[in-house]
């Protein structure tokens, strides 16, 4: 299938031109898209091209400005929040980046009602999270790893917790695992539906190892970062969930919510916690061990002022084939009764669905079946639900959006999505308004992404908030490469992949492959999404036939591909790289000699031992921020697949798939390791030791390190990577420059 | 201080048309909607339309659409009522008031111009 | 269109006695939690006054002795004490649906 079809005609060729990684690197062809943030069924607030904050009236069809540009830049806010109230809004400025979705801010509060910053009681600064109750204006916010309430804005704050240290206790906030392979959010508290308690978890990092890197700076001397950072089979941060009555916060304190006694018995995390009412709520625990995951249900005792996690109350779910749920456990969605839940997990065929719980998870009613998955529970109404999967036309790697009426019988099922811009839209998300009134639809391709608005109820299209006119303008004259996503069919296994072919792509020649790889357990990479990168770049103007393949391991396809690589992660992955690769070269269009291989993170672990398999195939390759060793990554990510690094469990494989294993492979294979030194994620350590072990066994090899740069590698160093990069392909390639 | 200044209220015939101005100071005209309210001798008040200044979006109490236009100079920080094909029933005092959209309230009220009309 | 029916249309008080103004509203105004109904003064020859908005928040420089409270159709303005100053004409007005529509008024006078 040709998703994104070149548009040259002869008559138009010479109008047109390539890509060029400037283009890339200027973000030249970047595209928008359009979450409206609401405030109620039919409002939402939309930052508008100049800067002001705008409320917009579905119903009405009228804008109000709630907060002008001037106002905004008077604290050089970035970022705003409004309180449910609508009195007031909180002003975010001095953003200051720490991990990758913790940052520190300064707030100011201002006054919609009298136009005025609120003077008195001012926050401190940097404040580490802040929210407003989800109704009226109370505030809570952390601060020094401490959580703090007001009533009202210009209130004195009281403080709720007292133990909070940096690197030791974690109040409110996540410490580093926990944010960045458990909750994927910078904060750890949550406001009951009404905003009477506040729930809070407190992690206690006082035994965790440091991990300590240089940060060079300008200084004489360079920083020390220290991070509690538990790597595999490492002392874990120890967690407790604390609720708090908010309108009497002094009366009986914080109470603490009691583990399930089959998870508090051994080693355990704390995945997620969700209000139900605001005198239930729903916490989600997980054994170290992560293949069993327990729900459990609280109630609040008026009487003892605690809260009570009855057995009856425990749902577990195990998996005896991987570990339990997907990237992460899946979080319950719950129905009207404030009792029964929506929840994906896997059905007897091994597919992620949606299950109804009612009474216990054995007695579940499976909502939606086939060998595809639901991938999203977005809302949950009195009579719909609307889900997003990969069902329709059996394409893995697409996202569309679907209604199931619960409110009827039998449930009738619908395709909001499926024909609406058939060809440019594919890959969908959704944003709802309260009660589902209204939702947004963001299309991000195969076509140029667009944005819309649509009813609640009658699913028809209300607007266009984004259509990116200036992108589909700015492409008009550009010879964008050709994408394909098929699939193959290797010994009982789907392989789907993306293929991306020069403009001017003719079967009968020969073209260098560049294989993109990342292959990270419950990853995807074939989706049908609309990118103008430097892959597209280096198809376009340089002429590369480009390859992304979803092997053993990845997402959406059911648990026999992802969960084979359970405790033996480095070997099917790459085994299926491989393979797609030879199937490649079958194709005829492939020189064989000029095949590369390319990978980020997991994909720099894959990449290099891809490049270490010592199947001859690729001439060269780049690994960038790899992994290369499991032992060096962090517990809860690299234990969920690979268990523990000690003898009775996984410490074999753990040392067989080590890059360090292989490096006598890199011989014949020219190699760029590529990472930052100040890399909180994937430590500089994995290169460094990849480095060593090739030095000791004496291969050339080809090195770049981004000094102070973390596992992103952005701003210029961004720019330098892809040149580096670029320079690297094209003389291993040898196309000139 | 915010003010808001109505004027070109007056005796006009049946079927005439008339234009009223409101000139506002003490704040910024594109940061807030401006609505127009009417009020008949001895009787309740009656809410016409509302502008977005900043793209110069209306919306209209259908009883007055197609009769009553609300539009806005912005380098003059005026907006305006035009009015058409006018009848005696819309002999008031015509008010504009400054609308707090995230609220959806009138905050700051003209002192009002009256228009009459009359054979 | 909503129709808002105030009563009672008119009221005769004393000045420190305690005075309830409602509204009712021919269908709910509840917009998800909140309720846009405002409350205004009008004194003779001058404009109204904007007393309260979303149901109970005051507005600027209005004193304390006015708050107002309600949702879904019923609404109340009460004047906790009354004052020489409060003899005037109230109106609600809801702007949870267009058109924004007004209440009849009440006329407080004085006893």
């Known amino acids: 299938i040709v998703l994104r079809p070149s548009r040259v005609h002869n008559s138009e060729e010479n109008t047109m031109r390539a890509l060029t990684l400037k283009d890339i690197l200027n973000g030249t062809f970047s595209y928008k898209t359009f979450f409206p943030n609401w405030i109620s069924g039919q409002e939402y607030l939309h930052q508008s091209a100049d800067n002001n904050i705008v409320l917009y009236n579905i119903e009405t069809g009228q804008s109000y400005t709630i907060l002008s540009n001037r106002t905004m830049k008077s604290v050089n806010a970035s970022n705003y929040g409004l309180s449910p109230d609508r009195q007031f809004v909180y002003l975010e400025s001095d953003y200051s980046k720490l991990w990758r979705y913790s940052y520190t801010a300064t707030y100011y509060i201002y006054d919609l009602s009298n136009g005025e910053f609120v003077r008195g009681n001012e926050l401190p600064r940097p404040i580490q999270y802040l929210c407003w109750s989800p109704v009226g204006s109370k505030l809570a916010y952390v601060y020094q790893n401490n959580i703090y309430l007001k009533q009202r804005p210009g209130d004195p704050p009281f403080q709720i917790t007292f133990n909070g240290r940096e690197n030791k206790i974690f109040n409110g906030i996540p410490d580093w695992v926990y944010e960045e392979e458990m909750l994927a959010t910078k904060y750890a508290l949550w406001w009951s539906p009404n905003g009477k308690f506040l729930a809070y978890a407190e992690f206690n990092d006082t035994d965790i190892p440091v991990i300590a890197y240089s940060y060079y700076g300008d200084e004489q001397y360079p920083r020390t970062i220290n991070i509690p950072y538990p790597k595999a089979g490492a002392k874990n941060p120890v967690v407790r969930i604390f609720i708090i009555d908010t309108t009497y916060p002094a009366y009986v304190g914080p109470q603490e919510v009691p583990v399930p006694a089959m998870i508090a018995s051994s080693d355990y995390y704390f995945s997620w916690l969700t209000w139900v009412t605001d005198e239930r709520v729903c916490l989600q625990w997980l054994k170290r061990v992560q293949n069993v995951s327990v729900l459990s249900i609280c109630d609040f005792r008026e009487d003892w002022q605690t809260w009570d996690c009855p057995k009856t109350q425990e749902h577990i779910e195990e998996s005896r084939t991987g570990w339990a749920g997907g990237f992460f456990v899946s979080t319950p969605v719950f129905s009207y009764d404030a009792i029964s839940y929506y929840k994906i997990f896997s059905d007897k065929d091994g597919y992620k669905h949606i299950h109804y719980i009612k009474d216990t998870v054995e007695n579940a009613i499976q909502i939606t079946s086939g060998k595809w998955e639901a991938i999203n529970i977005f809302r949950v109404t009195q009579d719909s639900l609307f889900y997003s999967s990969n069902e329709f036309e059996e394409y893995p790697g697409r996202r569309n959006i679907y209604r199931i009426s619960i409110g009827s019988y039998p449930p009738s099922k619908k395709c909001v999505t499926c024909h609406l811009r058939k060809e440019r839209c594919q890959y969908y998300t959704a944003s709802f308004s309260d009660y589902a009134k209204y939702y947004a639809l963001v299309c991000y391709g195969p076509g140029i992404p667009i944005s819309t608005l649509h009813d609640g109820r009658t699913d028809q299209e209300i607007k266009i908030l984004e259509e990116n006119k200036e992108l589909e303008n700015a492409l008009k004259n550009i010879q964008l490469p050709k994408e394909e996503i098929k699939k193959l069919e290797v010994d009982e296994i789907t392989l789907w992949y993306k293929m991306i072919l020069p403009p001017q792509f003719d079967r009968s020649k020969k073209y260098p492959l560049l294989i993109q790889v990342y292959g990270g357990p419950c990853s995807q990479s074939v989706r049908s999404v609309f990118a103008v990168n430097w892959i597209s770049y280096l198809a376009s103007k340089e002429g590369m036939v480009i390859a992304l393949v979803d092997g053993r391991g990845t997402a959406f396809q059911g648990d026999k591909l992802l969960y084979a690589v359970y405790r033996k992660l480095g070997v099917y992955e790459v085994e299926d790289q491989i393979t797609a690769v030879r199937k490649f070269i079958e194709m005829g269009f492939i020189d064989e000699k000029r095949i590369a291989i390319w990978g980020w993170s997991y994909g720099g672990y894959v990449s290099s031992l891809a490049l270490a398999s010592g199947t001859g195939l690729f001439k060269c390759g780049i690994a960038v921020a790899p992994v290369s060793s499991w032992e060096y990554y962090a517990s809860v990510y690299t234990e969920r697949f690979m268990g523990l690094p000690t003898k009775d469990d996984n410490l074999e494989h753990y040392k067989n798939s080590t890059v360090m294993a292989r490096a006598e492979y890199f011989r014949n294979v020219d190699y760029l390791l590529i990472h930052g030194t100040a890399d909180d994620n994937v430590h500089f350590q994995n290169s460094a030791q990849i480095a060593k072990a090739l030095v000791n066994a004496q291969v050339d090899f080809q090195a770049m390190w981004y000094s102070d740069q973390n596992h992103g590698l952005s701003g210029l160093s961004t720019n330098h990577l892809y040149t580096h990069m670029t320079h690297f392909l094209k003389q291993c390639f040898s196309l000139s420059d | 201080e915010v003010q808001l200044l109505e004027s070109g209220g007056g005796l006009v015939q049946p079927g005439g048309s008339l234009r009223l101005s409101c000139a506002a100071s003490?704040?910024?005209?594109?940061?807030?909607?401006m609505d127009w309210v009417r009020q008949a001798p001895g009787k309740g008040l009656e809410w016409v339309g509302d502008?977005?200044?900043?793209?110069?979006?209306?919306i209209y109490n259908q009883k007055f659409k197609g009769r009553f236009t609300i539009s806005i100079d912005k380098s003059k920080n005026t907006a305006y009522l035009q009015m058409n094909s006018l009848r005696a029933e819309d002999t008031a005092v015509y008010y504009c008031?400054?609308?707090?959209?995230?609220?959806?309230?009138?905050?700051?009220w003209g002192q009002g111009t009256t228009v009459t009309v009359s054979s | 269109d909503i129709q808002m029916t105030q009563s009672p249309s008119s009221l005769s008080a004393s000045v420190g006695d305690r005075v309830t103004i409602t509204c009712r509203a021919s269908?709910?105004?509840?917009?998800?939690?909140?309720?846009?109904i405002n409350w205004f003064q009008q004194k003779p020859g001058q404009p109204p006054k904007l007393l309260i908005y979303?149901?109970?928040n005051r507005g600027s420089g209005v004193p304390s002795r006015f708050s107002g409270s309600g949702s879904g159709t019923d609404f109340t303005l009460t004047i906790s004490s009354l004052q020489p100053e409060d003899f005037a004409m109230y109106f609600c007005?809801?702007?949870?649906?267009?058109?924004?529509?007004f209440g009849g008024g009440t006329k407080v006078e004085i006893k």
């Open positions: 979303g149901t109970s």
């Open positions: 007005q809801q702007s949870n649906e267009v058109p924004y529509t």
């Open positions: 008031t400054r609308f707090r959209g995230i609220h959806y309230a009138m905050d700051y």
């Open positions: 003490g704040y910024t005209l594109t940061d807030y909607n």
């Open positions: 269908e709910s105004v509840d917009n998800y939690g909140l309720s846009f």
């Open positions: 502008i977005y200044p900043n793209t110069g979006g209306t």
